[in-house]
Interface confidence: low
């Protein structure tokens, strides 16, 4: 039979790894395996045998596994042996690069390259490169052989230069053991150089000057060179040399400076590796202490408004304030002191607040006083323009311009203008000394003309505030003018004619001039004189006239300025027809009877009917009432022919009858001689 061992002859294992040695036979059914070290030390491994194969596993590999291992296989009476040598090593990590401090240009720094947990050390070589330049190399071949893991290092001291920025530092470690595959044999670490420059050349520029006056401002700008660019800090040296930090900007602006702001101001450029300072001394000179009162020496306040008087002490640290009125009247306001400022608040001012107010400021032993005059006024609304009526060309109109709730009215002026022309101006100067809100009126009368249309009435109210201001307070109201013209030249056209035959058509057309254009109203005049409205059209049309359409028709032109009236009489004529002449009780009566003779015409008023009695001497017209003639006691001479005639411009109709009167004694008829 045969025996084989794998790996053959010699192998190498890294401390801490796992390693398996396999012993196998061929040509033997069930061999017996045994393992031992050449010097019979402990195996420090586990054995697992299956059939014709036995595996020796070292897990983890340690120094105790650095031996020659022998595998013995027994098959019946035959025995075969194979040996394998196990070398161990340790090279578990990439080297480390350490710096003694930050890499500052011009300052030496030590770089250390460490190779940790190495075995065997005498096989180690460490190289240190800066860019392509080999800075140092060390071989550890002369080191004593010890069975332990060691960390070895290589040190180099160099002085960084600006050109080093961006270069790489490479630390390369090699373990010279032939069996190791190349990836394990060599390890390296690369670190890019971060080079710093400590702040330097720190300078301060001051604008406008290092000598300043109280209340002034100064801007100081600081610059400092370094890498990375230094952060700028501004501070101020206090009495105890403590630095009071003020700003983290390159520019420090101090405003509203006081004498106490005098001192040494320090600018510091700071980066990761250092700091650099520059100092400047500021001198703030005293400014005389003054008192300022605002809003000004005179204040105009509208009744009901709130007024804030502010008294400020400029150039004084801890002033004391007092307020009074010139007449020593009670103060109606609230005083609030805040530092170098005092306010007097007069809320909802009235006439009683109209005073000279004095603010006294005491600074150390010196007192200054400043006064302001509060003048109260009321001028809350625009003027109101009112007119006595609509504007009609040629008709006088009264205009009122009212200025409500005004004070002081001895400073009031009201002006009324028509277009550019002043109609009236009124100065209210006669009521001095009265303290109340009053409504003032300017009233004037003018005669509008058609030319005024398009112009405007302007009421201008000015409240002059005494000496307080050059420009008076001014309010105005504007009313555009529109002048009306009353209707005139109202004209009626009747087509074809005002006298017509019944059934004819007729158009009555009316026109009237005025501004605004008059509205037309057609009416019919009733018997009692009242007008019955018919139409608002310009033309009143009858398609087929009737007798009842006869009458007086009135056309009115109406606008805001007035009425113009014109009338026309329409006469509708008819041809008489259907005349009936009757006698009651009969055509033959006795002497002394009452007889009624009636004449009616169907389509003509009774007044047009004429009743006559024929006689030789001539016809006698009878006095009829409603077409009836009554004979109270018939006489013989009442007998005769009676005739009824209906007559118009268009035609006439005639009817007649014979009345017979019998005498009482003779009982015989009496006929008229005709």
């Amino acid at each position: 039979f045969k025996i084989e061992i794998s790996p053959e002859y010699k192998t190498i294992a890294q401390i801490g790894d796992s390693m398996a040695l396999t012993c196998s036979t061929t040509g033997c059914e069930s061999p017996l395996f045994s393992w031992r070290t050449q010097i019979d030390s402990p195996l420090n491994a586990k054995v697992r045998t299956e059939g014709s194969k036995s595996v020796l596993t070292m897990e983890p590999v340690s120094f105790e596994n650095e031996h020659s291992y022998l595998c013995t296989a027994t098959c019946g009476s035959g025995k075969l042996e194979r040996s394998i040598h196990v070398d161990i090593y340790s090279f578990p990590k990439d080297p480390e690069i350490q710096f003694s401090g930050p890499l500052e240009v011009g300052k030496p720094v030590t770089v250390k390259c460490l190779a940790p947990d190495i075995y065997p050390v005498y096989r180690l070589e460490i190289d240190l490169f800066k860019g392509d330049q080999l800075m140092n190399r060390q071989e550890f071949s002369s080191e004593e052989m010890t069975k332990s893991l060691e960390t070895k290092s290589l040190e180099v001291t160099f002085t960084p230069v600006i050109e080093d920025i961006g270069k790489a530092l490479v630390c390369r470690a090699k373990l010279h053991i032939d069996q190791i595959d190349s990836t394990l044999k060599e390890r390296e670490t690369v670190k890019e150089l971060q080079v710093y420059i400590s702040p330097r050349n720190t300078t301060i520029s001051v604008h406008p000057s290092t000598r300043l006056q109280e209340g002034g401002a100064v801007t100081m700008t600081c610059s400092s060179e370094g890498l990375p660019a230094p952060e700028i800090f501004w501070g101020r040296k206090l009495d105890n040399e403590v630095l009071q930090l003020l700003s983290g900007n390159a520019t420090l602006t101090l405003i509203a400076m006081r004498m106490e702001d005098s001192g040494v101001y320090v600018c510091e450029g700071v980066n990761l590796i250092g700091r650099d300072k520059a100092e400047v001394e500021l001198v703030v000179q005293e400014k005389p202490f003054i008192v300022d009162i605002s809003p000004g020496s005179q204040v105009a306040a509208q009744v009901g408004d709130s007024v804030v008087l502010t008294c400020a002490a400029i150039g004084c640290d801890s002033p004391s304030f007092s307020w009074r009125t010139q007449t020593d009247s009670p103060l109606n306001g609230v005083v609030r002191n805040e530092g170098a400022k005092s306010t007097l608040v007069l809320s909802s001012v009235g006439f009683e607040d109209e005073h000279s107010y004095l603010c006294a400021v005491t600074c150390l032993q010196r007192t200054l006083e400043k006064r302001t005059q509060v003048e109260v006024y009321s001028f809350p609304e625009d003027p109101v323009i009112k007119m006595s009526g609509p504007l009609v060309h040629g008709r006088p109109v009264t205009v009122n311009c009212t200025v409500p709730n005004v004070y002081p009215f001895d400073h009031l002026e009201i002006e009324l203008l028509k277009g550019e022309t002043t109609l009236m101006k009124k100065y209210f100067l006669e009521e001095m000394g009265i303290k109340s809100l009053e409504t003032k009126i300017l009233e004037t009368t003018f005669i509008p003309t058609i030319e005024d249309t398009g112009k405007s009435l302007v009421c201008l109210a000015r409240l002059h505030s005494g000496e307080m201001e050059s420009e008076p307070k001014q309010r105005q109201s504007v009313q555009p003018l529109y002048v009306n013209v009353a209707p005139k030249e109202t004209t009626i056209w009747v087509s074809p004619s005002p006298i017509l035959e019944e059934g004819s058509p007729v158009n009555l057309t009316c026109s009237s001039d005025g501004i605004p254009a008059p509205k037309i109203l057609w009416s019919r005049q009733l018997n009692n004189g009242e007008l019955q409205p018919l139409s608002e059209n310009t033309t009143l049309t009858f398609m087929s006239t009737k007798r009842d359409d006869s009458g007086i028709y009135v056309c009115e032109g109406i606008n805001e300025a007035g009425i113009s009236r014109k009338s026309v009489e329409l006469i509708i004529q008819v041809s008489p027809k259907d005349i009936q002449l009757t006698v009651f009780p009969s055509k033959s009566v006795k002497e002394g009877d009452t007889v009624i003779i009636s004449c009616t015409c169907g389509n003509v008023p009774e007044t047009w009917i004429i009743l006559k009695k024929k006689a030789k001497t001539g016809d006698m017209v009878l006095k009829s009432v409603d077409g009836s003639y009554t004979i109270r006691q018939a006489q013989l001479q009442d007998a005769g022919i009676y005739e009824c005639e209906s007559k118009t411009e268009v035609g006439s109709q005639l009817r007649s009858l014979t009345l017979d009167v019998k005498g009482k004694e003779h009982n015989k008829d009496y006929f008229s001689p005709e």
């Epitope: 206090l238 403590v242 009071q244 930090l245 003020l246 983290g248 004498m259 702001d261």
Partner: nanobody, 125 residues
Framework: QVQLQESGGGSVQAGGSLRLSCTAS????????MSWVRQAPGKGLEWVSG????????YYADSVKGRFTISRDNAKNTLYLQMNSLKSEDTALYYC??????????????????KGQGTQVTVSS
């Protein structure tokens, strides 16, 4: 005229929270370090916290570290102090001021370090 106006103070039980605000006007707020300082009854001014111009660096007194947070909003010209886990020893008048100390803060009346009128914080146990 430099003006600083604090607000947000009040009375709170121990362990409670408050948020103080300070609105600045009359100077270029975004160019200045800012601080919160406080004055307990009968005591001098004590620096509480500071912040740099853009808010990237903050500084705290040991007595408030981990409980107070300083921040700023340059667009609104406003400085804030978030106070959590308040203790009775935090009772004081709190001022905001220009300038900052990393570990100590003095604001003498004569120095150019304007502070506001203050806002009262009262913590009862």
């Amino acid at each position: 005229q430099v003006q600083l106006q604090e607000s947000g103070g009040g009375s709170v039980q121990a362990g409670g929270s408050l948020r103080l605000s300070c609105t600045a006007s009359g100077f270029t707020y975004s160019s200045y370090y800012m601080s919160w300082v406080r004055q307990a009854p009968g005591k001098g001014l004590e620096w509480v916290s500071g912040i740099n111009v853009d808010g990237s660096n903050t500084y705290y007194a040991d007595s408030v570290k981990g409980r107070f947070t300083i921040s700023r909003d340059n667009a609104k010209n406003t400085l804030y102090l978030q106070m959590n886990s308040l203790k009775s020893e935090d009772t004081a008048l709190y001022y905001c001021a220009t300038g900052s100390g990393r570990d100590s803060y003095d604001c003498y009346s004569g120095s150019w370090c304007p502070k506001g009128q203050g806002t009262q914080v009262t913590v009862s146990s």
